[in-house]
């Protein structure tokens, strides 16, 4: 009696796929040992076809996979493009040899069934419409026409030309003739359900002179497409239900006990468990749409179905498409904070992981909006202008090679609360969702800038100070000038010796920035911030206005300004004559196809709906110049 368990008999037809799940006892050794699938030969030898060590036989090349799910103590063998040659005896097992623990599986692959010559085979998916063609001779042109369904020896009338319709086919079956044709009638059966499958006989006339045609109707249940995704990654369900439901409401549901629970539909319904991490995007006018879910959780695994019906809810007899989603807990995507908290007037630094192999990919940050199907307008990107309303308070700092980039948002308000997505134009799996929670501030901010009404005069020296608490003593302080393509750190030099943090004087912790001489282009937003290496912390922002010197205004000697700066022993004076170049560059057209509709160039197309202008500024965010 083997402790391995699986399906003893698997049967399918040529061209299909099978997915065989084998269950093993939950032990540490079993979870990590080799898993295999082998074919039993007449000589008793079991030839490996695929194993978890990476082995793949020639006959399975390009059509099979073996995936271990240690958290479920299962492994799955997927085999596609079946042929009758695949019929045979197999073993799924584990161990370093094929003699270890195993389970015997019999696989039988049949030909697509054939019927007698006079039988027309109709194969349709659930929810679709079939048109059965019935030929007759001229002598029966004026006779009664009918379609019946065989049940054992009997044939029960479905519909006839006297306008009788079987109650179970009411509003679904119609009998008609096309144009002037006098030798053929048709029966349409719409909204097909599994029990419609079977043998039908259409008849024109009565008795021995009647014309009869046999029709075999096969109603196919949707074959779930298997999707294997990593924990914390994203999945896209591409749904193409056909033109006939183009104008009906669309939905995605998840099968649960006796129902299929709607996750999202085009009528505005959305499951709270997917709040902030789901988007439904119409693809075209033919009823195609896609649903993107980010931040996959273990509990997201299961059977999903998309469909269409005016109610936005699943209905029997309406077309559907199905998937089975597996979520693998052995994920390459690092665990990052899903909730970030901030206070009004303060700032947050959000770390966005991305595939380290794609350091040159374009990085984006968008705000998930709940309206209707959900959308995610881009707020900032490595080559995207900062969205209106975020000027001076939002920047993206890329850290090439680190596998992460940082987005800083300051001057927070409670309106900033909500869900945000980190994404790139590269690997579509690396999409992270962050919930930002902004609470009312109960104390003064950690960083304070003086003077708060900053107006600099052209040609003069202007110094602005940033006061920081002792807790930031050991961190790197910086000033940067904000522009549409990031916040470029200004050069700094340390003035005076640092005192030990033990004797830190709370009132004298200041980092200053000096503009000398002030130029018109110095006008704009400046940030004071703290960081430790690549890890960004608190920031605060101030707008520096620049005006012409008015006649009679006192001219400040630059040396006096510097002298002022030297008075504060803990000041780190930063002097800047840096000029920001704002070279405009065109956005990658692959990335913003429909205004700013995010498009994944590698995998699925235009995965989330976004809006805004498509301008851009070149340059690397966050670099010191």
């Amino acid at each position: 009696q083997s402790p391995i368990f699986g399906p003893q008999d698997v049967s399918s037809i040529e061209g299909n796929s099978v997915s065989i799940t084998c269950y093993y006892p939950d032990t540490s050794v079993n979870r990590h040992t080799r898993k295999y699938w082998c074919r039993q030969g007449a000589n008793g030898y079991c030839a490996t076809l695929i194993s978890s060590n990476g082995y793949l036989s020639k006959e399975y090349s390009g059509r099979a996979s073996l995936i271990n799910f240690p958290e479920n103590s299962t492994f799955v063998i997927n085999i596609a493009h079946l042929t009758q040659e695949d019929t045979g005896s197999y073993k799924c097992g584990l161990g370093t040899t094929n003699r270890g623990l195993f389970f015997d599986v019999s696989l039988e692959v049949s030909q697509v069934p054939e019927f007698p010559n006079d039988t027309h085979v109709y194969t349709k998916d659930i929810g679709r419409t079939v048109t059965i063609e019935c030929r007759f001779k001229e002598g029966n042109a004026h006779s009664k026409k009918s379609l019946c369904k065989k049940r054992g020896e009997a044939c029960e009338v479905v519909i006839d030309s006297t306008e009788y319709v079987d109650p179970s086919y009411k509003d679904r079956a119609i009998l008609f003739m096309k144009g002037t044709s006098r030798d053929i009638f048709y029966v349409n059966i719409s909204h097909l359900i599994p029990s419609d499958a079977g043998l039908y006989v259409c008849q024109a006339g009565e008795g021995p002179s009647a014309d009869k045609n046999n029709a075999d109707l096969q109603v196919l249940e949707p074959e779930p497409e298997l999707l294997y995704k990593d924990l914390r990654s994203s999945v896209t369900f591409e749904c193409d239900l056909g033109r006939e439901v183009a104008n009906d409401a669309k939905y995605l549901c998840r099968k649960n006990k006796e129902t299929c629970d709607v996750i999202i539909n085009t009528l505005g319904k959305r499951d709270p468990a997917f709040e902030g991490r789901i988007l439904l995007t119409p693809r075209d006018d033919n009823g195609r749409f896609s649903v993107l879910i980010t931040g996959l959780r273990k509990e997201d695994a299961g059977h999903y179905q998309c469909g269409a019906h005016s109610s936005g809810l699943p209905q029997e007899g309406w077309p559907v498409q199905a998937w089975q989603l597996f979520v693998n807990e052995e994920s390459t995507i690092p665990n990052s904070r899903s909730v970030v908290k901030g206070v009004t007037g303060g700032s947050v630094a959000i770390v966005c992981p991305y595939n380290p192999k794609e350091s040159s990919s374009l990085k984006y940050w968008c705000h998930w909006e709940a309206d209707e199907n959900g959308r995610c307008p881009v707020l900032v990107g490595t080559q995207a202008l900062v969205q209106e309303g975020y000027e001076g308070r939002l920047a993206l700092f890329d850290q090439p090679g680190s596998g992460a980039y940082t987005v800083i948002l300051n001057q927070l308000t409670t309106q900033d609360s909500g869900f945000y997505w980190c994404l790139t134009d590269g690997d579509s799996r690396w999409r992270t969702t962050i919930e930002l929670q902004v609470a009312e501030a109960t104390k003064k901010p950690d960083l304070e800038v003086t003077p708060q009404n900053a107006t600099a005069v052209i040609g003069e020296t202007f110094t602005i100070s940033c006061h920081y608490p002792c807790k930031f003593y050991s961190q790197e302080k910086y000033w940067c000038k904000w522009s549409n393509d990031g916040c470029h750190i200004l050069p700094s030099h340390d003035e005076g010796a640092r005192q030990s943090s033990v004797s830190c004087d709370q009132s004298s912790q200041i980092v200053s920035m000096t503009l000398n001489p002030v130029k018109k282009e110095d006008e704009g937003w400046y940030w004071c911030g703290v960081k430790e290496g690549q890890v960004y912390g608190e920031t605060t922002a101030i707008y520096v206005a620049v005006e012409e010197r008015t006649r009679g205004s006192p001219h400040i000697n630059p040396t006096d300004a510097n002298a002022r700066a030297k008075d504060a022993p803990e000041e780190e004076a930063m002097e800047s004559s840096v000029r920001e170049d704002e070279n405009k560059a065109n956005l990658d057209p692959r990335l913003f196809a429909d205004e700013r509709e995010i498009q994944n160039a590698g995998d699925q197309a235009q995965e989330n709906r976004a809006s805004g202008n498509a301008g851009s500024a070149g340059g690397q965010s966050g670099s010191s110049k």
Epitope: P7, D9, I20, P194, L220, K255, K257, A301, G302, Q324
Partner: nanobody
Framework: EVQLVESGGGLVQAGDSLRLSCAAS????????MGWFRQAPGKEREFVAT??????????YYADSVKGRFTISRDNAKNTVYLQMNSLKPEDTAVYYC?????????????????WGQGTLVTVSS
């Protein structure tokens, strides 16, 4: 709501055969598996056999105690599952329950099934 109705139970001699039927009606939209469990007097309900399907592919699972003797099958058009029981033994005596559901996980686990029939008694005398 899905309704399951079992039939075909009865009293037979050891070594005889019996065929159980389970007809499903109602919203079978989310059903991807149907199976049989049994419960002998004073014992826990145990897995017997399950058939799972995906389009035109069928997967049949059996308990070790019935392998080679019992065969599960289904008639898609009739929404009915059958259990053909051959070479019956006295230890096969039990109430046989039909179960149905999405059966995403291990088919031997009772919780994988969302609907249950009332049961049909099979008595095998020696």
């Amino acid at each position: 709501e899905v309704q399951l109705v079992e039939s075909g139970g009865g009293l037979v001699q050891a070594g005889d055969s019996l065929r159980l039927s389970c007809a499903a009606s109602g919203r079978t939209l989310t059903t991807y598996g149907m199976g049989w469990f049994r419960q002998a007097p004073g014992k826990e309900r145990e897995f017997v056999a399950t058939i799972k399907w995906s389009g035109s592919t069928n997967y049949k699972y059996y308990a070790d105690s019935v392998k080679g003797r019992f065969t599960i099958s289904r008639d898609n058009a009739k929404n009915t599952v059958y259990l053909q029981m051959n070479s019956l033994k006295p230890e096969d005596t039990a109430v046989y329950y039909c179960a149905a559901g999405t059966v995403l996980g291990d088919p031997r686990v009772l919780n994988e099934y969302d609907y249950w029939g009332q049961g049909t008694l099979v008595t095998v005398s020696s």
